[in-house]
Amino acid sequence: SQPQAVPPYASENQTCRDQEKEYYEPQHRICCSRCPPGTYVSAKCSRIRDTVCATCAENSYNEHWNYLTICQLCRPCDPVMGLEEIAPCTSKRKTQCRCQPGMFCAAWALECTHCELLSDCPPGTEAELKDEVGKGNNHCVPCKAGHFQNTSSPSARCQPHTRCENQGLVEAAPGTAQSDTTCKNPLEPLPPEMSGTMLM
């Protein structure tokens, strides 16, 4: 097998053997090493010498194999934009942000830039569960049979109707999507004006 060329090496077809860790330098018509994550180009390559990489300074980073001459500045998660930090910035990774609880990402440009309050789901509905929290606004779906939700809320979940018999009571009024079952003591009639769920 042919010996592997070590950067810098000449490239006539403007492509390099290892696209992730090497790049084509058009001025010199050679392939040079990229700098690993967490570093940047301190000195560019030439036909005599390879790229020299230096570690990113504190509060800066480069996430990928690169031939950047600077590191990117770490940016905090902006609470005014509804963002909160889930992981700090390192030399190899930018600050990881997410939407604050009760918010969703309203503006996305490679990453979330702006969060807004989740819409309330009205009584009788709940927010459809999403794969990723904060990814989109609430999509309210009706409570399934045997469940209810009695508030306007972005996060309240539909709860199962109370089963009166489990508490030694009897059903006074059936539950709906917006209200729980009303239970009563089997020996006492329920006054018509009472709207409580249980009478002991």
Partner: antibody, heavy 121, light 108 residues
Framework: QVQLQESGPGLVKPSQTLSLTCTVS??????????WSWIRQHPGKGLEWIGY???????YYNPSLKSRVAFSVDTSKNQFSLKLSSVTAADTAVYYC?????????????WGQGTMVTVSS | EIMLTQSPGTLSLSPGERATLSCRAS???????LAWYQQTPGQAPRLLIY???SRATGIPDRFSGSGSGTDFTLTISRLEPEDFSVYYC?????????FGQGTRLDIK
């Protein structure tokens, strides 16, 4: 402006190690875009590139001298050094330190004034 | 290793004349990576030209460089008294870096 100054013994015995230091003033040896070089000139002759180094540690030597040469950098003193082992009379020369500004690729834009080293018993 | 041959070995001219110094490489110097230096007796070389034709900082415009491939030229349009020195070419298109043997420019 940046200036370079070589220092070291002017006389070295055969088979011993030649040691020279170059002090950088008016700028930092830790500036990223520079390589720091050694070049020599035999009496009445042309110039010979010995090699160069970057403060981070990347070092390149002339293959004809590679087995005998070692460079080092002391950023705290703003100096870089040359060690040439097993010297013979053929190593008698004026030794220059010089800077490569990588914006000029591999041309030597600043030179020290040179120091004459004689190899003799 | 790329060998550089400079000619003539010595050039005798008068102040005010035009000087043309030649540097020929043993193989093609890709991307025109050639520099020229001036060295006066007892002094370190001084960079005049890099990348074949770019003048270094502070170099008068009477100095110019040209060429490509294997043939390169340093031209001094009107010789001044301080120009009478030794001139070296240097290539950095291949490892190791090499220099020519020099051209001595003498006053006629």
């Amino acid at each position: 402006q940046v200036q370079l100054q070589e220092s070291g013994p002017g006389l070295v015995k055969p088979s011993q190690t030649l040691s020279l230091t170059c002090t950088v003033s008016g700028g930092s040896i830790s500036s990223g875009g520079y390589f720091w070089s050694w070049i020599r000139q035999h009496p009445g002759k042309g110039l010979e590139w010995i090699g160069y180094t970057h403060y981070i540690g990347s070092t390149y030597y002339n293959p004809s001298l590679k087995s005998r040469v070692a460079f080092s950098v002391d950023t705290s003193k703003n100096q870089f050094s040359l060690k040439l082992s097993s010297v013979t009379a053929a190593d008698t020369a004026v030794y220059y330190c010089a800077r490569v500004d990588t914006a000029m690729v591999d041309a030597f834009d600043i030179w020290g004034q040179g120091t004459m080293v004689t190899v003799s018993s | 290793e790329i060998m550089l041959t400079q000619s003539p070995g010595t050039l005798s001219l008068s102040p005010g004349e035009r000087a043309t110094l030649s540097c020929r490489a043993s193989q093609n110097i890709d991307s025109s990576y050639l520099a020229w230096y001036q060295q006066t007796p007892g002094q370190a070389p001084r960079l005049l030209i890099y990348d074949t034709s770019s003048r270094a900082t502070g170099i008068p415009d009477r100095f110019s460089g040209s060429g490509s491939g294997t043939d390169f030229t340093l031209t001094i349009s009107r010789l001044e008294p301080e120009d009478f020195s030794v001139y070296y070419c240097q290539q950095y298109g291949g490892s190791p870096i090499t220099f020519g043997q020099g051209t001595r420019l003498d006053i006629k």
